[in-house]
Interface confidence: medium
Amino acid sequence: RTVPPMVNVTCSEVSEGNITVTCRASSFYPRNITLTWRQDGVSLSHNTQQWGDVLPDGNGTYQTWVATRIRQGEEQRFTCYMEHSGNHGTHPVPSGKVLALQSQW
């Protein structure tokens, strides 16, 4: 069976002018997934991203996340790229108010 992931992109402020963008994939099966941030259409190098483990979410499916830190104002240059079971998609950083929350970094 294949269950496609639900992908959600959120932003949180870490310091003035800097934000962490987090891309979360959830409720997918099987567990193999590619999740990475792209800047200007190109995957970021590994040293500028942080990944969460792929974990069971209790429903027989899995969840994971990837985050990167960017400067406020350059959100439109970034997209989250997802590939799962032959399907792929890109998800933009939402425009609008940034959550003033502590990030996972």
Epitope: V14, G41, V42, S43, R71
Partner: antibody, heavy 121, light 112 residues
């Protein structure tokens, strides 16, 4: 070995058009972003335009915006620069370069030999 | 746009002696991902430019280790520990932080 070969330069009158090509070999062209850089005779370097691997992200210098169009054909391993409404100040050697900064590598690590565009009446 | 400046614009050096080129940016090139997007290029006479240093202090592949890059967010230095005849040419710094990418005016290194 990586090779970038530009062509299409030449003499053109102000207001005219030219299409530059850059033939790439020795690497997986479709994986890499590309840029055009130019250099006026006896002057410094000026970045002109950028295109992402899939062609979905494109940027231009203000000096060429609305007149130049960057494009690529990944099946032909080729990069293009369509230059319209050319001006005397566009006279320069045009270089194509790879842009690999997101691959744990760096930008502009390979350059072509350049092609000369001369805009004069 | 980020403005890049360099000094000196001309640098006569005796072979075997050290050389230093300064570059400044009108805005910090330190990204929040902790990379500093400053590059150094050398254009030898009659040739295309070649990369020397990427992300401020990293030596590009095949570049002799007599070259080194250092700096902070807005002030950068390219050093050559012992200049050789083959080092002649024009050295450019470039910011790769945001569009449009911008170059410094160049520093011409020549042998005394």
């Amino acid at each position: 070995q990586v090779q970038l070969v530009e062509s299409g330069g030449g003499l053109v009158k102000p207001g005219g058009s030219l299409r530059l090509s850059c033939a790439a070999s020795g690497f997986t062209f479709s994986n890499y972003a590309m840029s055009w850089i130019r250099q006026a005779p006896g002057k410094g370097l000026e970045w002109v335009s950028y295109i992402s691997p899939g062609g979905d992200y494109i940027y231009y210098a203000d000096s060429v915006k609305g007149r130049f169009t960057i494009s690529r054909d990944n099946a032909k391993n080729s990069l293009y620069l369509q230059m319209n409404s050319l001006r005397a100040e566009d006279t320069a050697v045009y270089y194509c370069t790879t842009d690999r900064r997101h691959y744990g590598s760096y930008a502009m690590d390979y350059w072509g030999q350049g092609t000369l565009v001369t805009v004069s009446s | 746009d980020i403005v890049m400046t360099q000094s000196p614009l001309s640098l006569p050096v005796t072979p075997g002696e050290p050389a230093s080129i300064s570059c400044r940016s009108s805005k910090s090139l330190l990204h929040s991902n902790l990379n500093t997007y400053l590059y150094w290029f050398l254009q030898k006479p009659g040739q295309s430019p070649q990369i020397l240093i990427y992300r401020m202090s990293n030596l590009a592949s095949g570049v002799p280790d007599r070259f080194s890059g250092s700096g902070s967010g807005t002030a950068f230095t390219l050093k050559i520990s012992r200049v050789e005849a083959e080092d002649v040419g024009v050295y450019y710094c470039m910011q790769h932080l945001e569009y449009p990418f911008t170059f410094g005016p160049g520093t011409k290194l020549e042998i005394k």
